[in-house]
Interface confidence: medium
Amino acid sequence: AWELTILHTNDVHSRLEQTSEDSSKCVNASRCMGGVARLFTKVQQIRRAEPNVLLLDAGDQYQGTIWFTVYKGAEVAHFMNALRYDAMALGNHEFDNGVEGLIEPLLKEAKFPILSANIKAKGPLASQISGLYLPYKVLPVGDEVVGIVGYTSKETPFLSNPGTNLVFEDEITALQPEVDKLKTLNVNKIIALGHSGFEMDKLIAQKVRGVDVVVGGHSNTFLYTGNPPSKEVPAGKYPFIVTSDDGRKVPVVQAYAFGKYLGYLKIEFDERGNVISSHGNPILLNSSIPEDPSIKADINKWRIKLDNYSTQELGKTIVYLDGSSQSCRFRECNMGNLICDAMINNNLRHTDEMFWNHVSMCILNGGGIRSPIDERNNGTITWENLAAVLPFGGTFDLVQLKGSTLKKAFEHSVHRYGQSTGEFLQVGGIHVVYDLSRKPGDRVVKLDVLCTKCRVPSYDPLKMDEVYKVILPNFLANGGDGFQMIKDELLRHDSGDQDINVVSTYISKMKVIYPAVEGRIKFSTGSH
């Protein structure tokens, strides 16, 4: 028998520095977690103790903090090289700055293979990107070889900016011939490493003949056997065992997100490459693990540029940006409109001639807007200003919801109106009318939504049975501020870009902004 240790991360999202327990900015260092310096300590410890170790990343290193905003992926290549990753799969966020923003900073600079079997380049891009990412890679590990085959969410064109010259194929259809090829090369130990979410990971384990282990990402799935060490609630045991269609037991793993844990999976193979046993658990990278001093020093050196960036002007406002709780928790506020407009703008994807865009709607809890911005400071808007407005380090995510769920959400928005509570919704691509004289749960008297399948966008009545795409803060997608109906009834959830980054990009693009209060939210007293 031959034993392999798989160390894995996924959805690190630019958390190069240690973070608080909830993966936001580290405040009290004695209670902080993760970060590449601490990760390196643990990885090195395991590499020294065990003979056959692979360090793998399942995608979405890009996007999430000011690190990515400033360094645009160069930081990912630099620190992943420093940690000596063995392979990485492409995630959807790796395309956030377009194909060029992937090729130059990461693909050309990485000293490890970057993989995806279901992304096919065409046209002029095919020769430009050739060899910079691969469908699979055979890695020597000790006296053996291990095949790593990559995959990426086929929803990427809707979630990021891969352009028109990359085709995202069905994962299972694309993986099978690559695995078959590895088999013909006498590679009998194969890991599928990819970024399509836990449900697809399980399907790959079930359907793709010859895959021995699946290491996934995208859905931020936390798996754990025994008592979990922090706040995350396990979605299942680690590893999650799937019985394949040909009768094999295939371990599937994922390691939550944000570099908080290091996935640790020990696999035992027989001489024919069959998995005999698999066990392990994610390792919580808490403060009991010291940060490696050389990596930490490097982090501090790179950090200097970030501090300078946060005070630079992004753009100007010629109007007061009213982010006060007195406005945003009671009525339409222009800061809410600005943020929602930025959220929609960030999700413009013209992927279908029938649709002007795939999503037109935004909702945003008023309590998430924490500060106004005064235009009398020469109109200047900086990252620092935006960090005061959006201090929680969240993301703006894409969900799919039924109309009936949206209706419930808007009822919740005003169910205890007048108490300055955070659940009052700011909107984009939505016209809502409330009648506060009616009892809670029955106050939404009109809800019109901007069409997507139209050449001239116009407002249509919400259809209860229809499925809509909506951009919202991850806080709401996770049921925050009492929006349990969103968490319970959402049909799909894809994590998006860092909130501040979305707004700062929009302001930089617009140069001068002047958001108005324009009748998106109205109050009426109806007849009957």
């Epitope: 009109k446 249509d460 009545p461 009957h528």
Partner: antibody
Framework: EVQLVESGGGLVQPGRSLRLSCAAS????????MHWVRQAPGKGLEWVSG????????GYADSVRGRFTISRDNAKNSLYLQMNSLRAEDTALYYC??????????????????WGQGTTVTVSS | QTVVTQEPSASGTPGQRVTISCSGS????????VNWYQQLPGTAPKLLIY???QRPSGVPDRFSGSKSGISASLAISGLQSEDEADYYC???????????FGGGTKLTVL
């Protein structure tokens, strides 16, 4: 398939009562307001009554107010029209119709996007 | 008597553009949105236009609605024989606190 099927029509003497029913299928019934609309022989459409998704808002045309009662049973996906003190001028084809919205208010007025085939009510001695 | 009025009949030849109008008051058309329904002979009405000018899915773009002041109109371009039907406008009426239909216009395709 979205469908509305009316029943309960028939021949009735003036002053008597009749109860119309409408069975809904193919959509989430309790998400929408519902209406009764009638059409006298050779005449135009006349809105009779409407009811919001949760029965909190109810409206009637002046011509039937006080005599007709609209109700719904969301558990049974059914709409009803109780017609009392019937008159000859109530003779018509009665349609059940689904609203595009859930409310029965001026602010949420869109229109009726699904109609049944109608049930005939004849009031005659 | 009907509070929203329509001309009883209209006609046109195939391929022609026909306009059907609807007149009301400030309490209905003037202050609220207008719908249009088509009723083919012997069938139930069908929603053609809502919110003055919006077409439900499946309604051809030959049908268009507009509203100005206390009047609304339905235009049918490229008239076809299957467009022969009764057309009704409808609106919310503030003074009646309910919905009102126009008297209907019978469209004949010559």
């Amino acid at each position: 398939e979205v469908q509305l099927v009316e029943s309960g029509g028939g021949l009735v003497q003036p002053g008597r009562s009749l109860r119309l029913s409408c069975a809904a299928s193919g959509f989430t019934f309790d998400d929408y307001a519902m209406h009764w609309v009638r059409q006298a022989p050779g005449k135009g459409l006349e809105w009779v009554s409407g009811i919001s998704w949760n029965s909190n808002s109810i409206g009637y045309a002046d011509s039937v107010r006080g005599r007709f009662t609209i109700s719904r049973d969301n558990a049974k996906n059914s709409l009803y029209l109780q017609m009392n003190s019937l008159r000859a001028e109530d003779t018509a084809l009665y349609y059940c119709a689904k609203d595009m919205g859930w409310e029965l208010l001026k602010t949420s007025y869109y229109g009726m996007d699904v109609w049944g085939q109608g049930t005939t009510v004849t009031v005659s001695s | 008597q009907t509070v929203v009025t329509q001309e009883p009949s209209a006609s046109g030849t195939p391929g022609q553009r026909v306009t059907i109008s609807c007149s009301g008051s400030s309490s209905n058309i003037g202050g609220n949105t207008v719908n249009w329904y088509q009723q083919l002979p012997g069938t139930a009405p069908k929603l053609l236009i809502y919110s003055n000018n919006q077409r439900p899915s499946g309604v051809p773009d030959r049908f268009s609605g507009s509203k100005s002041g206390i009047s609304a109109s339905l235009a049918i371009s490229g008239l076809q024989s299957e467009d022969e039907a009764d057309y009704y406008c409808a609106a919310w009426d503030d003074s009646l606190n309910g919905r009102v239909f126009g008297g209907g216009t019978k469209l004949t395709v010559l």
